[in-house]
Interface confidence: low
């Protein structure tokens, strides 16, 4: 009797082991993603940003998938969603072709299931950079709180690609989830 | 029977209240420090900011340790890191030994048993903050999912410190874990 | 004595299952509100946004409460607010009132018992919008790890609401419950 | 077209000093970067220093501490003060222009150092 | 800082003939990439600057392409006054760096 009871013991310790287990890795994808610099766009123009690292250096990921320029859900889940988006130039890369520049980003999920785009987050500023200083920087950070179903996609959109600062402190974006969906 | 029964689950039950407790409390590390303005550097160079408070105000600190200006790691896991700086200037303070300003936050990650310093994040903006307006003001926000060893040190740099906004909802950094290292 | 046995190991399973269920679910309430454009304050004074979505689109709010324009913490914890404001202008809408701006966001916490309000995060730039360019645009974003109680209220205060981009990917705040107190 | 002259090679002992000049002419110079690059007998290309049109300087590691580039505007000039001199520094000197790279080189100057 | 990797060394070919030349960067420099000619006893000389744009006055032929890390120096048709050493160079962050040249010689 006593030796059944403690076979049950270990079965509910075990099962539940198990499911603490489980649920507290599987329950938390994240993602870090690095820009990678030697595929960025030139031109000024609105582009989707498709070359990140997700392997090396800062960038890591973990129950999530980065497959053709795209962070993919595979669980769903509340995540926190950021992205941290740097621009620089400097006099001697030559001439901006515009002194008045629009440096933006835009954070968008994307669902296959329903073909459709949206736009999650964006930040970003006008800026005038003028030919009497001979450095220019300017950083965008934007985050929030999203519920994603697997299969939905993440992707960043950045206006000026040729502008980015393809350091890995630098420009860089992320997920991590909080919670499951109830 | 019965009673032996009852035993054996009141020890499943308080063993498991035991490790839910101790895990999540001892899982979820976290700090939130504020800017001791009392010690600010002068001048425009950048600066590691090492006067920090951690339990006054908003800051706060649990399981991780701030000393010698950096906040050292407790415990190994994935932690959210982040940064608010915000520089500030008022005519009324004298004026700038330049109108062009290269306004920027480093967030650094040290290792001791290897000894090397990292930028995890950085973030900012060049300014032109010119004598024709009596106040000026910007801030930067940086934030990220990062993998931490424990004994690890994260520090702030920053550029053109004797600007620094003072107030404790101004300049800020921080961290909390997310989940453990698999 | 083995059904016996088995209706005590459900017990304990079962009030573990609500136990695990029953915490997890309450010990995470979210929200993330995005501006209701509706009605947004004129004047380029500093001001309280009252009017937010919280059930549309991407916003939504689970275990808080939202009223009266503000954020109502339920459950005492460790929380990470983070906001997210937009402000632009475009010629066609007219001249500013100036074209040196201060774009400012500033989150407050509000305690009912002590009638007291707190600042607990700041960010923003000074701007200087000149009539050379047709369009402007500035984001800002702040975020940070706070103890909340029950009862105590968030609120967001911007400057220049006019300027205010009533999309809900651009201005936007939230929070998240990361761990117990203590 | 764009024109740069260069003087003030020579010879130095080392731990000598040496001021090299670059003059620019048929284009506004104040609104250009300038730098110096240099290159030792027989080897590659090496940046030394450069200086922008708001008068920020860089240098390369290698001269750091020794050597300070400046330009005055009023004259069209750029300068480069080196110190410290060492066998190491020997090579032909050149100033360039550096909008969209290095468009325009002076014709060079030698600077030997030797005992 | 980043290195610059030019290949080959020193190559032989005729008049008429096509090269090309390639560099590589240790790390994405997008296309801050510019090319140099230099004869013996002269000064440098810009070809391309910004990976693919050709400098003022320089003849067709001469054409650069690439991005990221890998770039390429192409000279369509080989005329006896290209015979020199050409370098690449990045402008991407600071010290802008060299390549260590190719040497093309006549064949």
């Known amino acids: 009797g006593s030796q059944h009871i403690r076979a049950e013991k270990a079965m509910v310790d075990g099962s539940w082991l198990d499911l603490a287990k489980r649920s507290k890795l599987e329950a938390q994808p994240f993602a870090h993603l690095t820009i990678n610099a030697t595929d960025i766009p030139s031109g000024s123009h609105k582009v989707s940003l498709s070359s990140w690292y997700h392997d090396r250096g800062w960038a890591k990921i973990s129950n999530m998938t980065f497959s053709n320029g795209k962070l993919i859900v595979n669980q769903d889940g509340f995540y926190y969603l950021y992205a941290n988006i740097c621009f620089r130039h400097h006099e001697t890369s030559g001439d901006l072709a515009t002194e008045y520049l629009q440096l933006m980003v835009y954070v968008t999920k994307t669902s296959i299931k329903i073909p459709s785009s949206h736009t999650l987050m964006k930040g970003g500023s006008t800026k005038y950079w003028s030919g009497n200083s001979e450095f220019h920087f300017y950083s965008i950070n934007v985050g929030g709180f999203f519920k994603l179903r697997s299969g939905e996609e993440i992707s960043i959109e950045v206006s000026n690609p040729s502008l980015l600062d393809p350091d890995q402190d630098a420009t860089y974006f992320g997920a991590f989830k909080v919670r499951d969906i109830d | 029977g019965s009673q032996h029964i009852r035993a054996e689950k009141a020890m499943v039950d308080g063993s498991w209240l035991d490790l839910a407790k101790r895990s999540k409390l001892e899982a979820q590390p976290f700090a939130h420090l504020t800017i001791n303005a009392t010690d600010i550097p002068s001048g425009s160079h950048k600066v590691s900011l090492s006067s920090w408070y951690h339990d006054r105000g908003w800051a706060k600190i649990s399981n991780m340790t701030f000393s010698n200006g950096k906040l050292i790691v407790n415990q190994d896991g994935f932690y959210y890191l982040y940064a608010n700086i915000c520089f500030r200037h008022h005519e009324t303070s004298g004026d700038l030994a330049t109108e062009y300003l290269q306004l920027m936050v480093y967030v650094t990650k040290t290792s001791i048993k290897i000894p090397s310093s990292h930028t995890l994040m950085k973030g900012g903006s060049t300014k032109y903050w010119s004598g024709n307006s009596e106040f000026h003001f910007y801030s930067i926000n940086v934030g990220g999912f990062f993998k931490l060893r424990s004994g690890e040190e994260i520090s702030i740099e920053v550029s053109n410190p004797s600007l620094l906004d003072p107030d404790q909802d101004a300049t800020y950094f921080g961290a909390f874990k997310v989940r453990d290292i698999d | 004595g083995s059904q016996h046995i088995r209706a005590e190991k459900a017990m304990v399973d079962g009030s573990w299952l609500d136990l695990a269920k029953r915490s997890k679910l309450e010990a995470q309430p979210f929200a993330h509100l995005t501006i209701n454009a509706t009605d947004i304050p004129s004047g380029s004074h500093k001001v309280s946004l009252s009017s937010w979505y919280h059930d549309r689109g991407w916003a939504k709010i689970s275990n808080m409460t939202f009223s009266n324009g503000k954020l109502i913490v339920n459950q005492d914890g460790f929380y990470y607010l983070y906001a997210n404001i937009c402000f632009r202008h475009h010629e066609t809408s007219g001249d500013l009132a100036t074209e040196y701006l201060q774009l400012m966001v500033y989150v407050t916490k509000t305690s009912i018992k002590i009638p007291s309000s707190h600042t607990l995060m700041k960010g923003g730039s000074t701007k200087y919008w000149s009539g050379n360019s047709e369009f402007h645009f500035y984001s800002i974003n702040v975020g940070g790890f706070f103890k909340l109680r029950s009862g105590e209220e968030i609120s967001i205060e911007v400057s220049n609401p006019s300027l205010l981009d009533p999309d809900q990917d651009a201005t936007y705040f939230g929070a998240f419950k990361v761990r117990d107190i203590d | 077209e764009v024109q740069l002259v260069q003087s003030g090679g020579g010879l130095v002992h080392p731990g000598g000093s040496l001021r090299l000049s670059c003059v620019g002419s048929?284009?506004?110079?104040?609104?250009?970067?300038m730098h110096w690059v240099r290159q030792a007998p027989g080897k590659g290309l090496e940046w030394v220093s450069g200086i922008g049109s708001g008068g920020g300087t860089n240098y390369a590691d290698s001269v750091k501490g020794r050597f300070t580039i400046s330009r005055d505007t009023a004259k069209n000039s750029l300068y480069l003060q080196m110190n410290s001199l060492r066998a190491e520094d020997m090579a032909v000197y050149y100033c360039?222009?550096?909008?969209?790279?290095?468009?325009?080189w002076g014709q060079g100057t030698l600077v030997t150092v030797s005992s | 800082d980043i290195q610059m990797t030019q290949s080959p060394s020193s190559l032989s070919a005729s008049v008429g003939d096509r090269v090309t030349i390639t560099c590589r960067a240790s790390?994405?420099?997008?296309?801050?990439l510019a090319w140099y000619q230099q004869k013996p006893e002269k000064a440098p000389k810009s070809l391309i600057y910004?990976?693919?744009s050709l400098q003022s006055g320089v003849p067709s032929r001469f054409s650069g392409s690439g991005s990221g890390t890998d770039f390429t120096l192409t000279i369509s048709s080989l005329q006896p006054e290209d015979f020199a050493t050409y370098y690449c160079q990045q402008y991407n962050s600071y010290p802008p760096t060299f390549g260590q040249g190719t040497k093309v010689e006549i064949k």
């Open positions: 790390q994405g420099i997008s296309t801050w």
């Open positions: 048929r284009f506004t110079f104040s609104a250009y970067p």
């Open positions: 360039a222009r550096g909008r969209n790279s290095f468009d325009y």
């Open positions: 910004a990976a693919s």
